[in-house]
Interface confidence: low
């Protein structure tokens, strides 16, 4: 099967896992390391770049450990001694949840991203080309582990949402209530957390993430699509994601899909050409059986301005259109906080996104 | 190396009941899908449910649904299937197969993952 | 239901032959369908799936093709350990998999 060029990925690999890098590092390679803190046993796991099996010589140890208030530690082992520790004493990691860990190699550094946000920057101390070997041990199981070669073009860069010299702080939000859409549904006091309005550069493709504190709408020129974001923490019951937006002229169709992995666990599809709204579930690359009802007519209108709310819930997604209720889509996916990445595409243009 | 190894089969009166076991080994039953597959004697394959436990998603065939339950221990990193109402038509080899969890490119390269390991099988007799 | 018609439900075939097995799905399943071998008393082992990807360690003799809802197994050379009950399955929702009826290739 094709990879376009890049090594084939480890698939569900039992921890601790020790596996080859073929043709060691290089510049511009990016190893994504897709798993989930187990909640029970343990309160470290470790990713090693590594030269060998031996674990004597560790170009790079990424060691999250859930203790004293949780903390990161990297460092380099040569000939089984180990270096200064760097501390980073902020914890993205939370046990018994999903993560992607992403490691970009440079020439000067390895960029470390947690759930598609910068997280360190670890200036090599031995050469990196030493590297042929990732091992990853400790309390974790692994999805996966795959390789994107510096040579390839993914669609989706998972570097591309922030750039390196940004890097992103998230302060807690403040207590109290979160603005909503007049009068839908029951206003659910959401649980203090991190809500992200997402706003774009000038440059094209330059996205990054800004606190929002509280939600409001910012001026600024359209996103770029498709629009890929994460949503940190996933779904939960109260989590709220708002969008709003114009649907292009000549508008055929446009989504709103809400992804666990390599699945869409909820698939929002205005069909201009159907005059329908067609709501599924994407599991291994297949569709279900789609849900088209409304109470209403199609609330879409071609070269009309729109907002969308999608309120999670226990059992269901509430999805409103221009503050009024339209339909409740069953959790077909019922693990939420792995739903976890947003994407929109289509005809449309995006003014605003918060998860 | 990858492993499933069913065990819990035997003989049943019909309108009892029978749990399946699948023991994995060399993979993470959680980042996978588990997945039965009977085959009656002398008979071709007949899938009967399915389980990611990452996702928290599981489905039945309609032959089997409202009678049996697939779950999984990701701790001990087994699958099961409880079987109750059994019927004499139930009787068959049941396998647990795996079906990989996999890199979100792959999706974008239009790759459909099917049942790589298998389980050796093992035999439910419901008769009276 | 998605429906699996598999055809011949079996077949003679002599060491070398070509051999062509096909399998109609009654809507579309993309390219959502993989083969299986079997043998008596054993488990089926993958040998395709995507409709036309190879799994790691099967020969090369093996391949599988998609032309619509109409899809194919060929063995280009059959060999001895060939003689088997092939079946294809498709998975294009996780509630809808179905396998074929199967097709056993005996020696002639």
């Known amino acids: 099967m094709a990879f376009s060029g890049s090594q084939a990925p480890y698939l569900s690999p039992a921890v601790p896992f020790s596996g080859t890098i073929q043709g060691g590092l290089q510049d511009g390679l990016q190893i994504t390391v897709n798993g989930t803190v187990l909640s029970s046993s343990g309160t470290r796991f470790a990713v090693n770049f590594q030269t060998g099996f031996s674990g004597n010589d560790i170009a790079f140890h990424f060691n999250p450990r859930f203790e004293d208030g949780g903390y990161v530690v990297c460092n380099t082992r040569q000939n089984g001694s180990w270096g200064p520790e760097e501390r980073k004493t902020h914890m993205p990691f939370q046990k018994g949840m999903p993560f992607d860990l992403c490691f970009l190699v440079q020439s000067s550094d390895f960029k470390v991203m947690v759930n598609g946000i910068l997280f360190v920057q670890y200036f090599h101390r031995v050469p990196f080309h030493r590297v042929d070997t990732i091992s990853v041990n400790g309390s974790v199981q692994l999805s996966y582990i795959s390789f994107q070669n510096p040579r390839t073009v993914p669609v989706q860069p998972a570097f591309s949402t922030v750039p390196f010299s940004q890097p992103v702080c998230f302060p807690p939000r403040p207590r109290g209530r979160r603005q909503k859409p007049p009068g839908v549904w029951p206003a659910n006091p959401a649980p203090i957390t991190q809500t992200v309005i997402h706003t774009v550069q000038s440059a094209p493709g330059q996205m990054f993430s800004t606190p929002a504190i509280p939600p409001m709408m910012y001026p600024h020129p359209a996103y770029p699509m498709p629009f890929i974001t994460t949503i940190l923490g996933g779904l939960y019951p109260s989590k709220s994601i708002l969008l709003s937006g114009t649907v292009l002229p000549s508008a055929q169709r446009f989504h709103i899909n809400l992804c666990s992995g390599n699945h869409i666990a909820f698939h929002l599809n205005p069909r201009f050409d159907e005059n329908a709204v067609v709501r599924n579930t994407q599991i291994d690359n297949s569709w279900g059986s789609e849900e088209r009802s409304l109470p209403r007519k199609m609330p879409f209108v071609r070269g009309q301005s729109f907002s969308v709310w999608i309120l999670c819930e226990a059992h269901c997604l509430k999805v409103a259109v221009d503050g009024q209720h339209l339909f409740e889509y069953y959790h077909r996916l019922r693990n939420l906080p792995t739903i976890n990445r947003l994407e929109v595409g289509g005809d449309i243009q995006l003014t605003h996104v918060q998860t | 190396e990858v492993q499933l190894v069913e065990s819990g089969g035997g003989l049943v009166q019909p309108g009892g009941s029978l749990r399946l076991s699948c023991a994995a080994s060399?993979?993470?039953?959680?980042?996978?899908?588990i997945h039965w597959v009977r085959q009656a004697p002398g008979k071709g394959l007949e899938w009967v449910a399915s389980i990611y436990p990452y996702y928290g998603y599981t489905s039945y065939a309609d032959s089997v649904k409202g009678r049996f339950t697939i779950s999984a221990d990701t701790s001990k990193n087994t699958a099961y299937l409880q079987m109750n109402s059994l019927r004499a038509e139930d009787t068959a080899v049941y396998y647990c197969?795996?079906?990989?969890?996999?890199?979100?490119?792959?999706?974008?390269?239009?790759?459909?993952?099917?049942?790589?390991?298998w389980g050796q099988g093992t035999l439910v007799t419901v008769s009276s | 239901d998605i429906q699996m018609t598999q055809s011949p439900s079996s077949l003679s075939a002599s060491v070398g032959d070509r051999v062509t097995i096909t399998c109609r799905a009654s809507?579309?399943?993309?390219?959502?369908v993989a083969w299986y071998q079997q043998k008596p008393g054993k488990a089926p082992k993958l040998l395709i799936y995507?409709?036309?990807s190879l799994y790691s360690g099967v020969p090369s003799r093996f391949s599988g093709s998609r032309s619509g809802t109409d899809f194919t197994l060929t063995i280009s050379s059959l060999q001895p350990e060939d003689f088997a009950t092939y079946y294809c399955?498709?998975?294009?929702?996780?509630?809808?998999?179905?396998f074929g009826q199967g097709t056993k290739v005996e020696i002639k």
């Open positions: 399955q498709q998975s294009y929702f996780p509630s809808l998999v179905t």
């Open positions: 809507q579309s399943v993309s390219s959502a």
């Open positions: 060399g993979f993470t039953v959680y980042s996978s899908s």
């Open positions: 995507s409709a036309s």
């Open positions: 197969a795996r079906k990989i969890f996999w890199p979100v490119s792959w999706m974008w390269q239009g790759y459909y993952p099917a049942l790589d390991y």
